[in-house]
């Protein structure tokens, strides 16, 4: 902590300006009024203070606002934000999207720091849900943001926010996250016509149940193999050969290249070899002709 010393004569700061970069740490502490600093925070960013000097300015603000900074100060923190700890940020009440954007801009190009993660958490909790504008902003700065949330956190995303999600925002999502996001997308896009609907819902289909895939197979959607390979294995298994053929359209030929990978491998094992042969792709591993198929999982559920 900086020792309290009197301000030398004539050095008392009347405004926050470039002259302050020549002040020693103790002079900044003694000669800059915290209230003045708070009202002129927007100027700090334009002045090339050293990290040590920024530490002093932060200390002054901490003394002035022991319960946490007001939003009027937070919005203009600029590079001083990088000096904040998650503990500091937990005291804040950030409600303005402009404030959030300003602080994310400071950290732009870097990995999400603990400070940024805390800031986002505070902001979203304050809003009560992850609305479209917030999601738009967060995914613009951090494309992987959505997939960094737990399924529980994702449940607070309203369906209307799904419009802000881009395919690349879902690249690192696992099935549990897509299970939460898919039904929201299904609700959000339900007023679109068939082909437009498929374009929008495609990235979310890793969370789709079997019946939705069956319904899509009736819509001439021509799903690409990359999307098919991301579907839940257990959602794909009950699909018939005819349904998969309809679902993939001209892309059905791609099954041959993927026959050793899930979910294609597991799906092949569940189909009659006769049915697989109708595709003319040379897929092998189906159930031989004359064999009786017993669905033991279904039997278990019925007993």
């Amino acid at each position: 902590e900086v020792e309290k010393t009197a301000c030398p004569s004539g050095k008392k700061a009347r405004e926050i300006d470039e002259s302050l970069i020549f002040y020693k740490k103790w002079e900044l502490e003694a000669c800059v009024d915290a209230a003045l600093l708070a009202t002129q925070m927007d100027r700090v960013n334009a002045i090339p203070f050293t990290y040590e000097q920024l530490d002093v300015l932060k200390h002054k603000l901490d003394e002035l606002y022991p319960q946490g900074y007001p939003e009027s100060v937070i919005q203009h923190l600029g590079y001083l934000f990088l000096k904040m700890s998650p503990e500091d940020i937990r005291k804040w009440n950030v409600t303005s999207l402009e404030t959030l954007k300003a602080l994310l801009e400071v950290n732009k190009g870097h990995e999400m720091s603990p400070q940024v993660a805390t800031l986002i958490d505070r902001f979203v909790k304050g809003r009560g849900q992850l609305d479209k504008d917030t999601l738009d902003t967060l995914t613009a700065f951090y494309p992987g943001y959505l997939c960094s949330l737990s399924p529980e956190e994702l449940s607070s995303v309203p369906p209307s926010s799904i419009w802000a999600v881009r395919p690349q925002d879902l690249d690192t999502c696992d099935p549990r996250q897509l299970d939460v996001l898919y039904p929201k997308a299904r609700l959000a896009f339900q007023n679109m016509n068939g082909s437009e609907y498929f374009v929008k819902i495609q990235s979310f289909l890793g969370g789709a149940p079997t019946e939705d895939l069956k319904a899509l197979s009736q819509q001439n959607v021509s799903m690409d193999l990359a999307t098919f390979m991301k579907l839940r294995t257990d959602a794909v298994l009950p699909l018939t050969v005819a349904e998969v053929q309809k679902l993939l359209g001209p892309h059905v030929e791609g099954l041959k290249a993927e026959e050793r990978h899930r979910p294609v491998r597991d799906w092949i094992l569940r189909q009659r070899q006769d049915d697989l042969d109708t595709l003319g792709l040379g897929l092998q591993g189906g159930i031989p002709n004359g064999y009786l198929v017993l669905d033991l999982s279904m039997q278990e559920a019925l007993s």
Epitope: D179, L187, Q190, N191, L216, P238
Partner: antibody
């Protein structure tokens, strides 16, 4: 064909937890979304929430803090727990299947259980 | 949440006549509306979805119309088995919400 059957105690004391189970027979629980809907005597219907077989849920905000919906795929069952019940929670509780094949999208119900009356009283 | 209001609360119509039931949403639900029929001691039965599409096995005398905030269920020629309570339900957004019901009784 697929059938739904609700089961659970018909009487629950105030402040306790109401627990119901819905058994899905004649089909796999994995293919659809499954909901709970309730109807107080002589009144309208209220959606409680849904569950997917993976455990993903969405609940009505008016009940969310008191509701837990869970699933047991090995038994082809899903369950409802409603905590801190009062007389206002007295209702017929239905389990229902969110529609599947007839539309790619749509959160309405094409299959319902017969319902079970739960009375909250001391 | 979207509030669904049905009118009238009770409608008295003679067998063979036409019945018209109304449902109004507090905000637009596009065409994301379903109609159900419920008889005493029974679960609801899906009649109409998408505001106007009949569910499987529903007789042609049942028809739905409307979009946005105003919807109508029409039963063209009432049969004795049609006297029941009818509910509308929006699925444009969560939470899913139902109207309070219209009781259709024999005049």
């Amino acid at each position: 064909q697929v059938q739904l059957q609700e089961s659970g105690p018909g009487l629950v004391k105030p402040s306790e937890t109401l627990s119901l189970t819905c058994t899905v027979s004649g089909g796999s629980i994995q293919n659809y979304y499954w909901s709970w809907v309730r109807q107080p005597p002589g009144k309208g219907l209220e959606w409680i929430g849904y569950i997917f077989y993976s455990g993903s849920t969405q609940s009505n905000p008016s009940l969310k803090s008191r509701v837990i919906i869970s699933v047991d795929t090995s038994k082809n069952q899903f369950s409802l727990k409603l905590s801190s019940v009062t007389a206002a929670d007295t209702a017929v509780y239905y389990c229902a299947r969110e529609v599947g094949r007839i539309a790619v999208a749509g959160w309405f119900f094409d299959l319902w259980g017969r319902g079970t009356l739960v009375t909250v009283s001391s | 949440e979207i509030v669904m209001t049905q009118s009238p609360a009770t409608l008295s119509v003679s067998p063979g006549e036409r019945a018209t039931l109304s449902c109004r949403a507090s905000q637009s639900v596009n065409s994301n509306l379903a109609w159900y029929q419920q008889k005493p001691g029974q679960a609801p039965r899906l009649l109409i979805y998408g505001a106007s599409t009949r569910a499987t096995g529903i007789p042609a005398r049942f028809s739905g119309s409307g979009s946005g905030t105003e919807f109508t269920l029409t039963i063209s020629s009432l049969q004795s088995e049609d006297f029941a309570v009818y509910y509308c339900q929006q699925y444009n957004n969560w939470p899913l919400t139902f109207g309070q019901g219209t009781r259709l009784e024999i005049k």
